[in-house]
């Protein structure tokens, strides 16, 4: 009796869904009362499927309402664990253990990343010096650096601060500001540059003709 996996690494986006599969041999029709399926992640029990039913009492609270065994897939010889609304804390090594006559287990790694996609921006002006302050803010994982550029591709020097998100402790809140003398309709870009997996997200900031009070805010 041998379990196989078509993928031993899954990479998923924060807030998305993932279905991880372990395949096992089924001849003719599945005998539910002979089947045992366990899914665990480190010391957390996620699925305990015995005698045709799941036991939600043993499920770790962090997976409550988010993890389920796709029962229809069992009849196709697959123990498929579906996790919805994936969190950064879900990243790790998962183990599927299947008993059906014999027994076997396999490990699967789940990696979770969060792109810096929703970039908030703000432009304000110092009424005394007429210097503009440009601000970009976004949340993601892992850490990102922010590159400021002008429309003629010059790299500019901004100041970036990284804090923990209020939404989820592992999520980073990255805020970057650029102080610059600029003229109306000039265009600047803030690019959130993230490694592992590598991804760039850019917002465009256009200096307005005249700034309303308070400073304008919009989301890219």
């Amino acid at each position: 009796f041998t379990i196989t996996v078509s993928k031993d690494l899954y990479v998923v986006e924060y807030g998305g869904n993932v279905t991880m599969e372990c395949k096992f041999p089924v001849e003719k029709q599945l005998n539910l009362f002979a089947l045992i399926v366990y899914w665990e992640m480190e010391d957390k029990k996620i699925i305990q499927f015995v005698n045709g039913k799941e036991d939600l009492k043993v499920q770790h609270s962090s997976y409550s309402q988010r993890a389920q065994l796709l029962k229809d897939q069992l009849f196709l010889g697959k123990a498929a664990l579906q996790i919805t609304d994936v969190r950064l804390q879900d990243a790790g090594v998962y183990c599927c253990l299947i008993g059906y006559g014999g027994a076997d287990y396999k490990r699967i790694t789940l990696k979770v990343h969060a792109p810096y996609r929703n970039i908030s921006q703000r432009i304000s002006v110092d009424p005394v010096t007429s210097e503009h302050e440009l601000m970009c803010q976004a949340e993601g994982y892992p850490e990102a650096e922010v590159i400021w550029t002008s429309s003629d591709h010059r790299v500019l020097s901004g100041k970036t601060t990284i804090t923990n998100s209020n939404r989820e402790e592992k999520l980073f809140n990255v805020t970057s500001t650029l102080n610059i003398n600029a003229t109306a309709n000039e265009i600047f870009y803030c690019t959130f540059q993230r490694s592992g997996p590598e991804e760039n997200n850019t917002a465009e900031l256009v200096i307005p003709e005249r700034l309303p009070v308070p400073a304008s805010e919009r989301t890219h």
């Epitope: 005698n51 039913k53 036991d55 796709l70 009849f75 196709l76």
Partner: antibody, heavy 117, light 112 residues
């Protein structure tokens, strides 16, 4: 609201085949199992099997393996049961029944099949 | 397969009084997760069956609370308090623990 609309009565000859349909509405068709149940005149209920439209996975009561074939058409939210090599023993009312993994909650109105020469 | 057994007829009851219908399974329907996988259906004359109770004691949507169910892992009772004329029909128990799903033979509720 959930509705399961079954096809009309069938009169067929012994040895022939028949395909009964069950059109679902009012819910996400691919998220629930579609069961089929047989009821002979004046008799009880006998579970034939189910199909999960999302994946096409099926399970048959051993008594109906080779007799019934369950299929779905996801584009029209319709489940089908093909009954083959018909005999008088197959004369019955056939119901479709929606269920999740544990609970069957909504039934079709039934399709009467009469096998007679 | 799990065999479900029911008496064909209930004791005749008077309208407004209570009735009990019994069902027995050949193996325990109580799972280690604490849930008992027994359902009750009512088939009124000329109609499709309708779900009354699931997981032994949970009332299905729209079912009056005159209906209740209890039992052990293998012996179950459906109780109808204050029987009404519209309650007549055949009551089926069914197990949803194992595959194939199986039904009892049905119990006809008789009114005096």
């Amino acid at each position: 609201q959930v509705q399961l609309q079954q096809s009309g009565p069938e009169l067929v000859k012994p040895g022939a085949s028949v395909k009964i349909s069950c059109k679902a509405s009012g819910y996400t068709f691919t998220d629930y199992y579609m069961n089929w149940v047989k009821q002979r005149p004046g008799q009880g209920l006998e579970w034939i099997g189910w199909i999960f439209p999302g994946s096409g996975a099926t399970y048959y009561n051993e008594r109906f393996m080779g007799k019934a074939t369950l299929t779905v058409d996801k584009s029209s939210n319709t489940a089908y049961m093909l009954f083959s090599s018909l005999t008088s023993e197959d004369s019955a009312v056939y119901f479709c029944l929606r269920s999740d993994w544990d609970v069957g909650d909504f039934w079709g109105q039934g399709t009467t099949l009469t096998v007679s020469s | 397969d799990i065999v479900m057994t029911q008496a064909a007829f209930s004791n005749p009851v008077t309208l407004g009084t209570s009735a009990s219908i019994s069902c027995r399974s050949s193996r325990s329907l109580l799972h280690t997760n604490g849930i008992t996988y027994l359902s009750w259906f009512l088939q009124k004359p000329g109609q499709s069956p309708q779900l009354l109770i699931y997981q032994m004691s949970n009332l299905a949507s729209g079912v009056p609370d005159r209906f209740s169910s209890s039992g052990s892992g293998t012996d179950f009772t459906l109780r109808i308090s204050r029987v009404e004329a519209e309650d007549v029909g055949i009551y089926y128990c069914a197990q949803t623990l194992g595959l194939p799903r199986t039904f009892g033979g049905g119990t006809k509720l008789e009114i005096k």
